[in-house]
Interface confidence: low
C-alpha cells in the first residue's frame, strides 16, 4: 500500500483548513485550556505493524469527522470551510481504508489492536464531554480546534514515517 503524495497533500490541506477555521484568539481562551491526554504512544509507530498504524490513523480521521459533523459543530464554524474540511477528511479516510484492505486483506480481521482503537475513542470521548460541560461555547470550540490541529500533526508525522517504510 502506498500512501501517495496526494494523501500527503490532503493532510496539509486539512491542517490548513483547521488553521483557517480559527474564529477567536486562543489567548482570550487561556482559562478554558484543558489536557485531553492525547494518546501519543499510539502514534509513535515503532512498536506496531503497518496495518495497525493505518487503522489508528483511520480511527483518528473517522473520529475527527464525527466530531466536526455534529449540529453543534455546524453552528460553531464557517460552513464553507467545514464542507471543505469534510471532503479532505473523507478523502483521507478513503485512502486509508484502501490501505487497510490491502494490508489486512482478510474480512474478519478486526480493524486492529483494539486497545489502540479504544485509546483514540476515549480521547475523543474526553473532547466530547469537555464540549458538553462547556456548553459548546466559542472558547471551548477554539480549545478543541487547537487540540485537533495538534493531534492531526501527530497523524501527519506517523504517515510520513509509514511512507518512508514503503
Amino acid at each position: 500500500c502506498n500512501l501517495s503524495q496526494t494523501h500527503s497533500l490532503n493532510n496539509r490541506r486539512t491542517l490548513m483548513l483547521m488553521a483557517q477555521m480559527r474564529r477567536i484568539s486562543p489567548f482570550s481562551c487561556l482559562k478554558d485550556r484543558h489536557d485531553f491526554e492525547f494518546p501519543q504512544e499510539e502514534f509513535d509507530g515503532n512498536q506496531f505493524q503497518k496495518a495497525q498504524a493505518i487503522s489508528v490513523l483511520h480511527e483518528m480521521m473517522q473520529q475527527t469527522f464525527n466530531l466536526f459533523s455534529t449540529k453543534n459543530s455546524s453552528a460553531a464554524w464557517d460552513e464553507t470551510l467545514l464542507e471543505k474540511f469534510y471532503i479532505e477528511l473523507f478523502q483521507q479516510m478513503n485512502d486509508l481504508e484502501a490501505c487497510v484492505i490491502q494490508e489486512v486483506g482478510v474480512e474478519e480481521t478486526p480493524l486492529m489492536n483494539e486497545d489502540s482503537i479504544l485509546a483514540v475513542k476515549k480521547y475523543f470521548q474526553r473532547i466530547t464531554l469537555y464540549l458538553m460541560e462547556k456548553k459548546y461555547s466559542p472558547c471551548a470550540w477554539e480549545v478543541v480546534r487547537a487540540e485537533i490541529m495538534r493531534s492531526l500533526s501527530f497523524s501527519t508525522n506517523l504517515q510520513k514515517r509509514l511512507r518512508r517504510k514503503d
Epitope: N94, V100, V104, E107, E114
Partner: antibody
Amino acid sequence: QVQLVQSGAEVKKPGASVKVSCKASGYTFTNYWMHWVRQAPGQGLEWMGEINPSHGRTIYAQKFQGRVTMTRDTSTSTVYMELSSLRSEDTAVYYCARGGLGPAWFAYWGQGTLVTVSS
Amino acid sequence: EIVLTQSPATLSLSPGERATLSCSAGSSVDSSYLYWYQQKPGQAPRLLIYSTSNLASGIPARFSGSGSGTDFTLTISSLEPEDFAVYYCHQWSSYPFTFGQGTKLEIK
C-alpha cells in the same frame, strides 16, 4: 459465524412509532458500524442511516432526519431503529446491515422486518 | 446526493447468454466504494462485487465488474438459472449512501 437477527413483523397506524431491533452475534459488536436500509414493496433499496455501536454516534440520511432514532445496547449486542410519525409510505421491509471495509461492507444482513402502516 | 441510475430497468435473456448491466452515477464515485448486490424475492440482498471489480466470497467467476468515475458495469458471462434476480449498484463514496433503482434480470 456472523448473524444479524431482527424482530418480527409489525402493523402500525399512521402517526404511530415503530421500533425494530437487530441482534448481532459472531463478531465484536463494537468494531463495525451498523446500518439500516429499507425496501418498500416492489421498490428498490434505500439507506436510512448508521450507528457506531462503540459510542452510539449516528449519521442519518437527510430524508429521515427528525423521524428516525438509532440506538444500541452493547450489553446485548443489539441495535434499534425507531421511526416515528409513520405514514403509509413507510410500509416497507427494514433491514439492518453490517458495515466494514472492503469485502465486509454490507456482506451481512438481517432477515428483514416488515412494517405495515395502515389505518 | 449521488444518484445512481441503472439500465436497463428489465433485461430479458436466456440461460447461457451474456448479461451486461449498467450503473451511471450523477457525479463521480470513488471506485473503491462502488458495490453490486443481488436480491431474490423474499430474501435480503447478497454482496456480489466490492470495490468495482472484486468478487465477494463464494461468488462464481462468471460475475465481473468494471468501470470508473460515473460509469460502472456488472457482467455475467454465461447466465445460470439461479442468476435471474434483481441487481443493485450501491455507492458509499459519499453521504448519503445510495442505491440504484435496480435491474430485473428475467428469463426470456
